[in-house]
């Protein structure tokens, strides 16, 4: 019968998917950076603010040279899909203060999401081991005040910024071992 | 155009072995993480082993597991599976398959019977 | 038996529009992993038709669609041909196979 027919190339491959990740990423950082700044504005705040239900930052600039493909992608999802409930929480949450944000909180989730989906099909592609990306997640309760939502979405910005910062970086210096 | 050539099936005795192989073209082989899914006459399809792009994992599915491996070579575009202590229940047409799977070959037969 | 469930059969007349349902466990679509859908025309091999739940491959028409919710997954075909006549399969990431896992197909009949 001869060689059979082949398949059309689907609409991306794993290099072109860790480019649309890095994208993705820088996009979302910009976003972060300018929701942060507007939260500072309105609500100045007093010093750092940390939740204890957030992810320790993953990475720092000296371990940058050791990342490893799998390591990278699977830390930045399980921490990127523990930012994206945090920000599913603070919406649902927040007090009438933050109402005036929801907007840009909305936008910012819808981003995360996307973000997840790419580093998801991209792990599919490239066939590396995934971390159930809906693993329990530590219970949230209602913010003690309204002051209390307010703090909480200044430590999620905050750590959020710090995240996308690292991932930047990490997807980057990946691009060339793939 | 993407290729995915699959070779090496035909009949075999229970107890048996053969080594099926899959010459791929048309893509970057290697930065995808490759597949050997099967379908037993009239049946649906069933994934049977996966290897990541550079080779360091590689997962089976129980009904083959310590008796089928997979590998694969980069420098050559080519993805293999040796199967051994071939059962009649193996028999089926075996697929290679790219990425999600994302590209699929035609598929070779594989017969196992006395 | 299939570890994602989907209906063995499906029919429609030419121009109709038929949904096939996809559902999963706890290691697999409940926890979050993104579906794809391959279709498989008649002595042929499968075909990706959607992935990431509701991504089209170029060259895939319109008239495909995908959708997750929750804990299923569905593929719906508007403008029913006679061409679309195939057996179709849902697929899935699965944490507890560490590869993926397909629904047993669903035949599609164009009457």
């Known amino acids: 019968p001869g060689p059979p027919a082949g398949s059309p190339r689907v609409s991306s491959d794993p290099r072109a998917d860790l480019d649309s990740a890095v994208l993705l990423t820088r996009s979302l950082l910009a976003d972060t950076r300018q929701l942060a700044a507007q939260m500072r504005d309105k609500f100045p705040a007093d010093g750092d603010h940390n939740l204890d239900s957030l992810p320790t930052l993953a990475m720092s600039a000296g371990t940058l040279g050791s990342l490893q493909l799998p390591g990278v992608l699977t830390r930045l999802r399980v921490d990127l899909m523990s930012y994206f409930r945090h920000v599913q929480w603070l919406r649902r949450a927040a007090g009438p203060s933050l109402k005036t944000l929801e907007p840009e909180l909305g936008a910012l989730q819808a981003r995360l999401e996307r973000l997840l989906r790419r580093l998801q099909l991209l792990m599919s592609r490239l066939a590396l081991p995934q971390a159930a990306p809906d693993q329990p997640a530590v219970p949230l309760g209602p913010p003690a005040s309204a002051w209390g939502s307010i703090r909480a979405a200044h430590a999620i910005l905050g750590g959020l910024h710090l995240t996308l910062d690292w991932a930047v970086r990490g997807l980057l210096l990946l691009k060339t071992r793939l | 155009e993407v290729q995915l050539l699959e070779s090496g099936g035909g009949l075999v005795q229970p107890g048996g072995s053969l080594r099926l192989s899959c010459a791929a073209s048309?893509?970057?082989?290697?930065?995808?993480?490759m597949h050997w899914v099967r379908q037993a006459p009239g049946k649906g399809l069933e994934w049977v082993a996966v290897?990541?792009?550079?080779?360091?994992?590689?997962y089976y599915a129980d009904s083959v597991k310590g008796r089928f491996t997979i590998s694969r070579d980069n420098s050559k575009n080519t993805l293999y599976l040796q199967m051994n202590s071939l059962r009649a229940e193996d028999t089926a047409v075996y697929y290679c398959?790219?990425?999600?799977?994302?590209?699929w070959g035609q598929g070779t037969l594989v017969t196992v019977s006395s | 038996q299939s570890v994602l469930t989907q209906p063995p059969s499906a029919s429609g007349t030419p121009g109709q529009r038929v949904t096939i349902s996809c559902s999963g466990s706890?290691?697999?679509?409940?926890?979050?992993?993104?579906v794809h859908w391959y279709q498989q025309l008649p002595g042929t091999a499968p075909k990706l038709l959607i992935y990431?739940?509701?991504e089209r491959p170029s060259g895939v028409p319109d008239r495909f669609s995908g959708s997750k919710s929750g804990t299923s997954a569905s593929l719906a075909i508007s403008g029913l041909r006679s061409e679309d006549e195939a057996d179709y399969y849902c697929?899935?990431?699965?944490?507890?196979?560490?590869?993926?896992?397909f629904g047993g197909g669903t035949k599609l009949t164009v009457l």
């Open positions: 048309g893509f970057t082989f290697s930065s995808y993480g």
């Open positions: 398959a790219a990425g999600v799977p994302d590209y």
């Open positions: 990431s739940n509701e």
């Open positions: 290897i990541s792009y550079d080779g360091s994992y590689k």
């Open positions: 697929a899935a990431w699965d944490s507890s196979l560490y590869g993926p896992v």
């Open positions: 706890s290691s697999n679509i409940w926890s979050g992993y993104d």
